[in-house]
Amino acid sequence: AYRPSETLCGGELVDTLQFVCGDRGFYFSRPASRVSRRSRGIVEECCFRSCDLALLETYCATPAKSE
């Protein structure tokens, strides 16, 4: 089970993302924000330091809108 805040790397990170995001899929990196101008990756955010469920969910792909 996923704990509130922990370090996730490699296959464990992928498995957790697949569980959290489900059919939506996920991204390893997000586009840079206007503030930082740098892309951020889930590897850096969750493998190199602890991350929580809310942060994991921000890497889920947005589901396509149904007609």
């Epitope: 996730l8 790397c9 490699g10 390893f28 740098r38 990756g41 590897v43 493998c47 190199f48 330091r49």
Partner: antibody, heavy 119, light 111 residues
Framework: QVQLQESGPGLVKPSETLSLTCTVS????????WSWIRQPPGRGLEWIGY???????NYNPSLKSRVTMSVDTSKNQFSLKLSSVTAADTAVYYC?????????????WGQGATVTVSS | QSVLTQAPSVSGAPGQRVTISCTGR?????????VHWYQQFPGTAPKLLIY???NRPSGVPDRFSGSKSGTSASLAITGLQAEDEADYYC???????????FGGGTKLTVL
């Protein structure tokens, strides 16, 4: 237990491209993060970059324009290419692995490949 | 100039306790990124000594311990032994550089 072995030319001419390969044994290349680090003679460690087999990469900003990392899952190998080399690129080059059991720490290293840039 | 600052050298007599510090900033250690420590003997590859600030991989003696506070981290070695003479490097991730960073290394001499 994962083991790594670097291979490639020990001598590269200035302005040419340095190419190294790291062969992985005892583990699947699709399970971990892979990294390259170098160490110039008598100096400290310098991170070159790392990547995940899915295509996610991150390179040292100071080397980014010259670095390419790739993976060959069929051979269980990953490689480093560094273009337009100069004498400053002379170093021992290490491949390393983040298995994920060590919170992002590089827990498996190759023995290192000495590369000299000289004409 | 390394992003993570380490003293170039430190020394101690056998049996003593020595501490090696690694000073970072708010974009690396202070941002919550884990610190790892490596031990390197001349002519050999570095070996992971401490991971995730304070954890020891299997096989590393409990004489080695790590800690982190604020923007700094420390490696402590108790009961110093002659075979501990080596170079020690800290490593973390830096969000402003978008990459991993190493300290400049500390050479430990056992007197």
């Amino acid at each position: 237990q994962v083991q790594l072995q670097e291979s490639g030319p020990g001598l590269v001419k200035p302005s040419e491209t340095l190419s190294l390969t790291c062969t992985v044994s005892g583990g699947s290349i699709s399970s971990y993060y892979w990294s390259w680090i170098r160490q110039p003679p008598g100096r400290g460690l310098e991170w070159i970059g790392y990547f995940f087999y899915s295509g996610y990469t991150n390179y040292n900003p100071s080397l980014k324009s010259r670095v390419t990392m790739s993976v060959d899952t069929s051979k269980n190998q990953f490689s480093l290419k560094l273009s337009s080399v100069t004498a400053a690129d002379t170093a021992v080059y290490y491949c390393a692995c983040i298995t994920g059991t060590t919170k992002g720490g590089m827990d498996v290293w190759g023995q290192g490949a000495t590369v000299t840039v000289s004409s | 100039q390394s992003v993570l600052t380490q003293a170039p050298s430190v020394s101690g007599a056998p049996g003593q306790r020595v501490t090696i510090s690694c000073t970072g900033r708010s974009s690396n250690i202070g941002a919550g990124y884990d610190v790892h420590w490596y031990q390197q003997f001349p002519g050999t590859a570095p070996k992971l000594l401490i991971y995730g600030n304070s954890n020891r991989p299997s096989g590393v003696p409990d004489r080695f311990s790590g800690s982190k506070s604020g923007t700094s981290a420390s490696l402590a070695i108790t009961g110093l032994q002659a075979e501990d003479e080596a170079d020690y490097y800290c490593q973390s991730y830096d969000s402003s550089l978008s990459g991993s960073v190493f300290g400049g290394g500390t050479k430990l001499t056992v007197l």
